[in-house]
């Protein structure tokens, strides 16, 4: 539209903005590495950091791995979004006995109320079925409550409604993928770890707690026991260990009871963008070892500029045990540029790059 021309020209003259013809507005140009949260950003607040797939931007502004719902007994309740983790919950027909951040460490099947008990509250993803004693005299023949006499309050002591435990129920108490049978006390009343002996005669502890060693009477040496692939974080919460399942990652440190698994790029690759306990983007290491690469003097004379290797390849040099095993990487964005002046003026050592001490520090 002709009337838009002056506005468009003014906008184009501002390097920090661009003109969007679709919305006929001047838009703020997000800085490198940040991406717009809307079609036509107006201010820096409308730009955000872009995390890799399966990572989200946490409250501290860090790219953090979304939890995985890949276990058989979990389903995805909410997807992994740019600013929030995926949320998992137990499959229908199961409830969560040990919850962890954004997921559940242990799911169990809902109990079936045994004979003489009826369902007071059906089971949910968070809670087991709650049963209560069926009142005597009540039978399916009762067409309506008025036709069925309630016993007088003193006749039978009414038991407090509780989730049934295996002692009074034939309901399955197995996790979906097997494992040790766990007394299905209410999740909030778990006083012993799965598979541990009865807690009778011991001080009871918090949900999910189990001792580091058999817990002596009155001893404080009991810590919370997280499920496999979870660790106890500094806040005392069970948190999912990061996954190294991406093709370009390998495990550097395993998942331990009090620390996450740590992932690193495969040999021959380098981390271009980090993530908590992992690397969000690995790229092939872009410099060949001195003795296998093209001579820098030759390159300097030609003033060559060359690009990063295509996805899944190494720089053009003879394979070495270290760089020969890199798989396809996720979008390498390293550009390479020969600094001809540096090549000409710096001393060029004849030896290969020197390795550091075994500590690397």
């Amino acid at each position: 539209f002709p009337q838009d021309r002056p506005f468009e020209d003014t906008c184009r003259g501002n390097p920090g903005h661009y003109y969007d013809k679709a919305v006929r507005r001047c838009c703020y140009r997000c800085p490198t590495g940040l991406f717009p949260t809307q079609q036509c950003p107006q201010r820096p607040a409308d730009c955000r950091k872009q995390c890799e797939p399966d990572y989200y931007l946490d409250e501290a502004g860090r790219c953090t791995a979304c939890v995985s719902c890949s276990r058989d007994d979990l389903v995805e309740k909410m997807p992994c979004a740019w600013n929030s983790s995926r949320v998992c919950e137990c499959q229908p027909g199961m409830f969560c006995a040990v919850s962890v951040v954004n997921s559940c460490a242990r799911c169990f099947f809902h109990s079936v109320c045994p004979a003489g008990m009826i369902v007071k509250f059906p089971g949910t993803a968070q809670k087991n079925t709650v049963c209560e004693p069926a009142s005597p005299g009540v039978s399916p023949a009762c067409a309506s409550p008025e036709n069925c006499k309630e016993p007088s309050s003193g006749t039978i002591p009414q038991a407090k409604p509780t989730p049934v435990s295996p002692a009074t129920s034939n309901a399955s108490t197995m996790p979906l993928r097997g494992g040790t049978r766990l007394a299905q006390e209410a999740a909030s009343k778990l006083t012993r770890a799965p598979g541990s002996p009865s807690s009778v005669g011991r001080p009871s502890s918090d949900p999910g707690l189990s001792p580091t060693q058999p817990c002596p009477q009155g001893s404080g040496d009991c810590r919370k026991q997280c499920e496999p692939d979870y660790y106890l974080d500094e806040a005392g919460r069970c948190t999912a260990c990061v996954s190294c399942s991406r093709d370009d990652l390998v495990e550097k440190t395993p998942c331990a009871w009090n620390s996450s698994r740590i992932c690193e790029c495969r040999p021959g690759m380098i981390c271009a963008t980090s993530a908590t306990n992992s690397c969000a983007r690995c790229v092939p290491y872009p410099i060949c070892a001195a003795e296998t690469g093209t001579k820098p003097q030759d390159m300097a004379e030609k003033d060559t500029t060359f690009e990063a290797p295509p996805v899944g390849t190494q720089p053009d040099c003879s394979p070495t045990p270290e760089n020969g095993e890199a798989p396809a990487s996720t979008s390498p964005t390293l550009s390479s540029l020969v600094d001809s002046q540096a090549s000409k003026t710096l001393p060029i050592p004849t030896s290969a790059p020197i390795a550091l001490s075994s500590t690397g520090k």
């Epitope: 380098i270 981390c271 908590t276 690397c279 410099i287 001195a290 270290e322 020197i354």
Partner: nanobody, 122 residues
Framework: EVQLVESGGGLVQPGGSLRLSCTAS????????MAWYRRAPGNECELVSI???????YYTDSVKGRFTISRDNAKNTVFLYLNSLQPEDTAVYYC????????????????WGPGTQVTVSS
């Protein structure tokens, strides 16, 4: 034991320039490849540039054409020249030795030296 000290940071206006230095000690020869990484406020550790022992250089896309890395092997020093600085270059800059070996992990910022703060603001 390898120790690095970064210096040369400061406050500069958009379009301005700085020269960062990284002085290394503990190397037995001319030294390995060296890398510069940076961490902007609230962001992850990001690779900026690498220089090989024989002076070949590599840059991440966002700094290509604006930053220049060089080294003086005699003084065990690596330099990073920052030109045409933009607000998004604001970060703490760190150098790291032998990145092929040491920077495969998720965080190569702050493991060898304290870093030097670069702030680009009008």
């Amino acid at each position: 034991e390898v120790q690095l000290v970064e210096s040369g940071g400061g406050l500069v206006q958009p379009g301005g320039s700085l020269r960062l230095s990284c002085t290394a000690s503990g190397f037995t020869d001319d030294g390995p490849d060296m890398a510069w990484y940076r961490r902007a406020p609230g962001n992850e550790c990001e690779l900026v540039s690498i220089i090989s022992a024989d002076g070949r250089t590599y840059y991440t896309d966002s700094v290509k054409g604006r930053f220049t890395i060089s080294r003086d092997n005699a003084k065990n020093t690596v330099f990073l020249y920052l030109n045409s600085l933009q607000p998004e270059d604001t970060a703490v800059y760190y150098c790291a030795p032998d990145p092929r070996r040491n920077c495969r992990g998720g965080d190569c910022c702050g493991n060898w030296g304290p870093g030097t703060q670069v702030t680009v603001s009008s």
